[in-house]
């Protein structure tokens, strides 16, 4: 990895577990200001592999609300608007980081957690295995 | 929101900015143990809206490496294997949380940051605007 010189103005840490426990400022900085205003909000309906969005809420997690995509069909929508099973709708998954309250119910103590979420669906050609 | 009784065993915080600055344990807990072994690793190639994955590295961010999807075509791949421009390949984007070193180069002090990443691509019917 890249070695970065330490900033002399860094907060001090006497913690023997350092750097496993760190200080995090929860005032979120949003770097998405220059993103395209034409957001992907309607893609779930217009896709050939459309999906529904399910709300997953957990007050012990930050963010507490995560939206999970579930493909509407096993096949994909063809040009006639019918479901075509020669193609497959599959979820696109991504591992994301969330903060889990630890110990539970603590407002100022968290542990980093990795979870797998389905973000949307895409249409793929199936791998077909025929019986000999 | 849901009010949760505070755990009496929580770490104490005298910080006047509390709960804006919190303690986070970086020993990541991975909750993906029961995920489907059939991972989405090859979907980028088999999709009718295929994509390439670009490595985005930033040592001031945690995680320092994020993979960004970029759709290979403006159109979608049809049954003949050709790009069909009557349909559009579009990126599925998701806002994720990352930790940004703050002040810069500090190993144990971070700020929560929200960034928009492209996870994969999906094929959508275009919105056609006809000239009057």
């Amino acid at each position: 990895g890249i070695t970065i010189p330490r900033n002399p103005g860094c907060p001090n840490s006497e913690d023997k577990n350092f750097p496993r426990t760190v200080m995090v400022n929860l005032n979120i900085h949003n770097r998405n200001t220059n993103t395209n205003p034409k957001r992907s909000s309607d893609y779930y309906n217009r896709s050939t592999s459309p999906w529904n969005l399910h709300r997953n809420e957990d007050p012990e997690r930050y963010p507490s609300v995560i939206w999970e995509a579930k493909c509407r069909h096993l096949g994909c929508i063809n040009a006639d608007g019918n479901v075509d099973y020669h193609m497959n709708s599959v979820p696109i998954q991504q591992e994301i980081l969330v903060l889990r309250r630890e110990p539970p119910h603590c407002p100022n103590s968290f542990r980093l957690e990795k979870i797998l979420v389905s973000v949307g669906c895409t249409c793929v050609t199936p791998i077909v295995h025929h019986v000999a | 929101g849901i009010t949760i009784p505070r755990n009496p065993g929580c770490p104490n915080s005298e910080d006047k900015n509390f709960p804006r600055t919190v303690m986070v344990n970086l020993n990541i807990h991975n909750r993906n143990t029961n995920t489907n072994p059939k991972r989405s690793s090859d979907y980028y190639n088999r999709s009718t809206s295929p994509w390439n994955l670009h490595r985005n590295e930033d040592p001031e961010r945690y995680p320092s490496v994020i993979w960004e999807a970029k759709c290979r075509h403006l159109g979608c791949i049809n049954a003949d294997g050709n790009v069909d421009y009557h349909m559009n390949s579009v990126p599925i984007q998701q806002e994720i949380l990352v930790l940004r070193r703050e002040p810069p180069h500090c190993p144990n002090s971070f700020r929560l940051e929200k960034i928009l990443v492209s996870v994969g691509c999906t094929c959508v019917t275009p919105i056609v605007h006809h000239v009057a």
Epitope: L74, G81 | N36
Partner: antibody
């Protein structure tokens, strides 16, 4: 529990269109389910005809696709089957069924079936 | 089309004894999403089919635990640990990975 009831004429002439309706009770149409038609010729096995989702998206058995139309009327809690240009080979018991479309993609509740004979 | 082949065609059994039905598909039933959409139904005389097992091995609500499903890829089995009189009828395997198709049926009858 959800109940499904097929209705329609028991006798259809060759070359005509067979029309059946399925009325769903004790359940509102939602995106979690697809609504299917299956048939069973006398003394034979089951053949899936097609389904329609809450939003009107359909999928048909390729062998019947050119002759089949399935439609839905959510306001009446009904969905319908039309099979055109029928022949004696279309004589069967026709079942409507609810397909769980959220979890396991199969028919979990069926109507009791209606017998249709194609004959002049 | 995916062809589902069931064996045997007819299965004479003694009440209280186990029974096993086999189902083979002409191509793998593993969907691109990793799931296998293979299901089992029972059709009793004069009745409509009733779902027993979904996605290979999951018992539908109200189905007794003497019924179990297993298998993967193209080969699947339905087992009844101890056959009861109410289990008699025609058993169908069905797949919904590549639209819906059914096996030809296996008739479970008293020996």
């Amino acid at each position: 529990d959800v109940q499904l009831q097929e209705s329609g004429p028991g006798l259809v002439k060759p070359s005509q269109t067979l029309s059946l309706t399925c009325t769903v009770s004790s359940y509102s149409f939602t995106s979690d389910y697809a609504w299917s038609w299956i048939r069973q010729p006398p003394g034979k096995g089951l053949e899936w005809i097609g389904y329609i989702t809450y939003s009107g998206v359909t999928s048909y058995n390729p062998s019947l696709k050119s002759r089949v139309t399935i439609s839905v009327d959510t306001s009446k809690n009904q969905f319908s089957l039309k099979l055109s240009s029928v022949t004696a080979a279309d004589t069967a018991v026709y079942y409507c069924a609810r397909a769980d479309y959220d979890s396991y993609y199969t028919m979990d509740y069926w109507g009791q079936g209606t017998s249709v004979t194609v004959s002049s | 089309d995916v062809v589902m082949t069931q064996t045997p065609l007819s299965l004479p059994v003694t009440l209280g004894q186990p029974a096993s039905i086999s189902c083979r598909s002409s191509q793998s039933l593993v969907h691109s999403n990793g799931n296998t959409y293979l299901h089992w139904y029972l059709q009793k005389p004069g009745q409509s089919p009733r779902l027993l097992i979904y996605k290979v091995s999951n018992r539908f609500s109200g189905v007794p635990d003497r019924f179990s499903g297993s298998g993967s890829g193209t080969d699947f089995t339905l087992k009844i640990s101890r056959v009861e009189a109410e289990d008699l009828g025609v058993y169908y395997c069905s797949q919904s990975t590549h639209f819906w198709t059914f096996g030809g049926g296996t008739k479970l009858e008293i020996k």
